[in-house]
């Protein structure tokens, strides 16, 4: 029961984490204009991994994609790669873990196979979480490095944009979402790995007991089975709840009345 709960909780935590990683990757607010000197600004800039946006005091928001690959900083490309790898690994991990869930019975799948799948998905979640945390941390480090380097007509920042003396960038909401989401995915992965230990059949040292029946001699050996061997198929009629988890990823940076791209 505890194993099922740990596995289920690990799956749910990882699912939330991966949804968060996807949300963070799509969000436009990876870096936001530093408002330390001017808390009320008529023009507010913020940038994501894929586009940069400007929200005017009028309420209009204009976002422009980075329509170049070669012109983008290598660090930004690296962050993109880390986040995408994190999402892909997480998605595969989720798919594997659905079939590994103890509460879901698919055909005559053995518990040892479920244990292996649980371990696999757990490792995938851990790597996915680490990728997200690494990506966000690299971007944060890049922001800290560039923070004091924003001077007039210097080509720095996302996509080689001109930085005027007034504009400096600080941590955006996406960074915090990414850190939390990466952490959750990592925790979920660890929980799956812990659950895997409980799912795997342990080798017992019981002595073989022989039962003599008339005409037949059948020996049952309760112990001595390897983890990869199954205990036999489940003949009970169990309902399979295979509801696909739907993630609604609707990210809007800073509510605005007029968004146009």
């Amino acid at each position: 029961m505890a194993v099922t709960a740990c596995q289920g909780l690990g799956f749910v935590v990882s699912l939330i984490g991966i949804a968060g990683i996807i949300a963070a990757t799509c969000m436009d607010q990876w870096s936001t204009q530093d408002l330390y000197n001017n808390p009320v600004t008529a023009v507010f800039n913020y940038q994501g991994l894929w586009r940069s946006c400007v929200r005017e005091s009028s309420g209009f928001t204009e976002c422009r994609g980075y329509f170049t690959l070669l012109g983008l900083p290598a660090m930004l490309q690296a962050v993109r790669a880390l986040m995408i790898v994190g999402i892909v690994l997480g998605a595969i991990g989720l798919l594997v873990s659905i079939f590994a869930l103890k509460c879901i019975r698919i055909g005559s799948m053995e518990d040892s196979a479920k244990a292996n799948m649980t371990l696999t998905s757990g490792i995938m979640f851990i790597v996915s979480g680490l990728c997200a945390i690494a990506g966000v941390s690299v971007f944060a480090n890049m922001l800290v490095t560039n923070f004091w380097m924003s001077t007039a007509n210097m080509y720095t920042g996302m996509g080689g944009m001109v930085q005027t003396v007034q504009t400096r960038y600080t941590f955006g909401a996406a960074l915090f979402v990414g850190w939390v989401a990466g952490g959750l995915t990592l925790i979920g992965g660890v929980m799956m790995c812990i659950a895997c230990r409980g799912l795997a059949p342990e080798e017992t040292n019981y002595k073989a007991v022989s039962y003599h029946a008339s005409g037949h001699s059948v020996a049952y050996k309760p112990g001595g089975f390897k983890a990869s061997t199954g205990f036999g198929s489940n003949t009970k009629n169990k309902k399979i709840y295979d509801g696909g988890a739907r993630t609604e990823d609707e990210v809007q940076s800073y509510p605005s009345k007029h968004d146009y791209v």
């Epitope: 008529a42 023009v43 940069s52 400007v54 309420g59 504009t167 009345k257 007029h258």
Partner: antibody
Framework: QVQLVQSGAEVKKPGASVKVSCKAS????????MNWVRQAPGQGLEWMGN????????SYNQKFKGRVTLTIDKSTSTVYMELSSLRSEDTAVYYC???????????WGQGTTVTVSS | DIVMTQSPDSLAVSLGERATMNCKSS????????????LTWYQQKPGQPPKLLIY???TRKSGVPDRFTGSGSGTDFTLTISSLQAEDVAVYYC?????????FGGGTKVEIK
């Protein structure tokens, strides 16, 4: 068509308050910020503040040191500008103006003349 | 606060001739995020509210005649009327739309010579 209709001229004594209204029509009222600009006789334009009818957020010119208060009435699509502790130098034409792309003011009210005299 | 300085104070130009006025800001009005200059030009005729001509330093508002052209970047901006018409006699104001408080220039009065 877009119209911003302001209330009539006002004559006030120093120290009093004045409340000028600006009724908007012909567009989505909550979709555009409303600004207030004043112009003293023979002088240039001076921005006083703005209000976002959607969220109710305001920004003020600190020159007025809290004397200006902007409010809205969504039900009548009207913006109000109240200026307190009036002085003779507050004598001016007060305009409401809708904020557009680039934070520019694309439509203006006809103006309300406020005269402060003892 | 950003200080907007317009020059000249007044300008007398013959009908059909080019009228050029300048606006200088104390800080750059160029926004790094979209590489747009947050400067606006208005025309005000006596007894009337100002009328928007140009925003983002060079984008003409729909309905504004193409003889009005805005140019410049950073701190120096220019409004040019390529061929002055009688109805262009007015005071022209530039405005900082980049940073609060939004500030206006003192205006340039355009007259017919």
């Amino acid at each position: 068509q877009v119209q911003l209709v302001q209330s009539g001229a006002e004559v006030k004594k120093p120290g009093a308050s004045v409340k000028v209204s600006c009724k908007a029509s012909g567009y989505s009222f909550t979709g555009y910020n409303m600004n207030w600009v004043r112009q003293a006789p023979g002088q240039g334009l001076e921005w006083m503040g703005n209000i976002d009818p959607y969220y109710g957020g305001t920004s003020y010119n600190q020159k007025f040191k809290g004397r200006v208060t902007l409010t809205i009435d969504k039900s009548t699509s009207t913006v109000y500008m109240e200026l307190s502790s009036l002085r003779s130098e507050d004598t001016a034409v007060y305009y409401c103006a809708r904020m557009y792309h680039g934070n520019a003011f694309d439509y203006w009210g006809q103006g309300t003349t406020v005269t402060v005299s003892s | 606060d950003i200080v907007m300085t317009q020059s000249p104070d007044s300008l007398a130009v013959s009908l059909g001739e080019r009228a050029t006025m300048n606006c200088k800001s104390s800080q750059s009005l160029l926004n790094s995020g979209n590489l747009k200059n947050y400067l606006t030009w208005y025309q005000q005729k006596p007894g009337q509210p100002p009328k928007l001509l140009i925003y983002w330093a060079s984008t003409r508002k729909s309905g504004v005649p193409d003889r009005f052209t805005g140019s410049g970047s950073g701190t120096d901006f220019t409004l040019t009327i390529s061929s002055l018409q009688a109805e262009d006699v007015a005071v022209y104001y530039c405005q900082n739309d980049y940073s609060y408080p939004l500030t206006f220039g003192g205006g340039t009065k355009v007259e017919i010579k």
